[in-house]
């Protein structure tokens, strides 16, 4: 079966709709919003989970400083163009023929403009920096079992090798996760860092796009580890072009 | 098609290494994990490490407590695995595998490398 | 390390034979097990990926189901040439990845 092997679901995507018309019967899933098959052994591309969700009813000194030009989402929602391979399309534009430029995982890197605004290619995020604050402890976590378990959940939850987990730093309470993933070291079946760090942001928010599992249970040697806020920066291979007046 | 091949039988001392190689040829040797994996003879497999061509990057078995290195050569689409200090408990046949980021399937496999260690 | 536990480690069947191989985890691994064939004398082959996933050229009379810690192995009608041993492996966690002892599948 293509997605879960006895009740046709998708394990990774909540926001699919399945049924059992794949080659043979297979149980085969398809994303809200765009129709697209997804491989539910693995997360589904940030596009086409954006894709579903605008489709949805509505209801200190070793802690990395952001570099000048890290990106932050503060835009927010939006529905998005995606590629054939559920990949963000360059150029983004609203209904209102506003539109903008965005890199990998979606997040705008230019001012807006009108139809007239070219994006010549997709800028590729290689660098992500999740930064999180927890809810006081007794004591401190202690640093080496914090990465572990951080490297841990980033692989067995959102199958992202460790190899892609640059760094955990922390500075109670504190916790910095960086991801590093260039275009050349992705080999075939790795995850992409900028969806691994979208699934991890939703689990954190309580919002979680894995079917039937769990809400994310971080422990470090049986602590609980709950996260007050997340800020996540978003480096990308070219830096971005904003105007002077946004700056100010 | 796809296939890995592999560098001849070898006899080693107690003490010696070995360096193994895997040739790889029909897909591109950078996109693909690769792995090594041994059978000693009428047991079962035991993995020892992996290695990403396009970085070099390499994880191991801890089992084999920095005997074990793995690298690459992406002129040739080669890679190579080195053991250290051999016993003769590292008597084997040793494999490389094309490997899989998500499912950490083997899909392809080298035919083989013997390696005897013996006084 | 997650422990992979193959049963039986041996068995007899003769050729027409349904025949059902188990493999079981130490714990959860989801459904990323794989399963292999493995002839005296040659590498393993790829059989089933991520616990069902038939690997391109296997016959269908392979099939793989489970999830979880239970995972089983099936060949619905054996064939002459089917006679080997079977591998089960794990790729969930962090490394190690770990294989079971394996199962030899013999002619009655």
């Known amino acids: 079966h293509t997605a879960a092997q006895d009740n046709c679901t998708c394990p990774t995507n909540k926001m699919t709709v399945c049924s059992p018309d794949g080659p043979g019967g297979r149980c085969q899933c398809r994303a809200l919003g765009s129709g697209m098959a997804v491989d539910c052994s693995t997360l589904t591309s940030k596009c086409l989970l954006l894709k579903a969700r605008m489709s949805a009813p509505k209801n200190a000194r070793t802690l990395v400083r952001p570099s000048e030009h890290a990106l932050v989402d503060n835009d927010g929602l939006y529905d998005p163009d995606c590629d054939p391979e559920g990949r963000f399309k360059a150029r983004q534009c609203n209904q209102t023929s506003v539109c903008w430029c965005v890199n990998s995982v979606g997040v705008r890197r230019t001012d807006k403009g009108d139809l007239s605004l070219r994006c010549d290619e997709l800028v590729r995020t290689h660098h992500i920096l999740i930064d999180l604050r927890h809810r006081p402890t007794a004591g401190a976590f202690n640093h080496s079992d914090l990465d572990a378990e951080l490297r841990r959940l980033f692989r067995e939850r959102y199958r992202l090798h460790p190899k892609f987990v640059a760094a955990v730093h922390y500075e109670q309470p504190t916790i910095q996760i960086e991801l590093r993933q260039n275009t050349s070291q992705k080999a075939a079946g790795d995850v992409d860092i900028g969806d691994a760090a979208y699934y991890f942001e939703r689990d954190i928010k309580g919002e979680s796009l894995f079917q039937g599992r769990g809400g994310l249970d971080l422990r470090v040697r049986g602590e609980p580890l709950q996260v007050e806020r997340t800020l996540i920066y978003y480096l990308d291979e070219i830096p971005p072009k904003f105007s002077m007046k946004r700056l100010t | 098609q796809v296939q890995l091949v592999q560098s001849g039988a070898e006899v080693k001392k107690p003490g010696a290494s070995v360096k193994v190689s895997c040739k790889a040829s029909?897909?591109?040797?950078?996109?693909?994990?690769m792995h090594w994996v041994r059978q000693a003879p009428g047991q079962g497999l035991e993995w020892m490490g992996e290695?990403?061509?396009?970085?070099?990057?390499?994880s191991y078995n801890q089992k084999f407590k920095g005997r074990v290195t793995i690298t690459r050569d992406t002129s040739t689409s080669t890679a190579y695995m080195e053991l250290s200090s051999l016993r003769s408990e590292d008597t084997a046949v040793y494999y490389c595998?094309?490997?899989?980021?998500?499912?950490?399937?083997?899909?392809?496999w080298g035919q083989g490398t013997l390696v005897t260690v013996s006084s | 390390d997650i422990q992979m536990t193959q049963s039986p480690s041996s068995l007899s069947a003769s050729v027409g034979d349904r025949v059902t191989i188990t493999c079981r985890a130490s714990?959860?691994?989801?459904?990323?097990l794989n399963w292999y064939q493995q002839k005296p004398g040659k590498a393993p082959k790829l059989l089933i990926y991520?616990?069902?996933r038939l690997h391109s050229g296997v016959p269908s009379r392979f099939s793989g189901s489970g999830s979880g810690t239970d995972f089983t192995l099936t060949i619905s009608s054996l064939q002459p040439e089917d006679f080997a041993t079977y591998f089960c492996?794990?790729?969930?966690?962090?490394?190690?990845?770990?294989f079971g002892q394996g199962t030899k599948l013999e002619i009655k």
């Open positions: 492996q794990q790729g969930y966690t962090l490394p190690p990845y770990t």
């Open positions: 029909g897909y591109t040797f950078t996109s693909y994990w």
């Open positions: 290695i990403t061509p396009s970085d070099g990057y390499t």
């Open positions: 991520y616990a069902s």
């Open positions: 595998a094309r490997g899989h980021g998500n499912y950490v399937s083997f899909d392809y």
């Open positions: 714990q959860d691994i989801s459904n990323y």
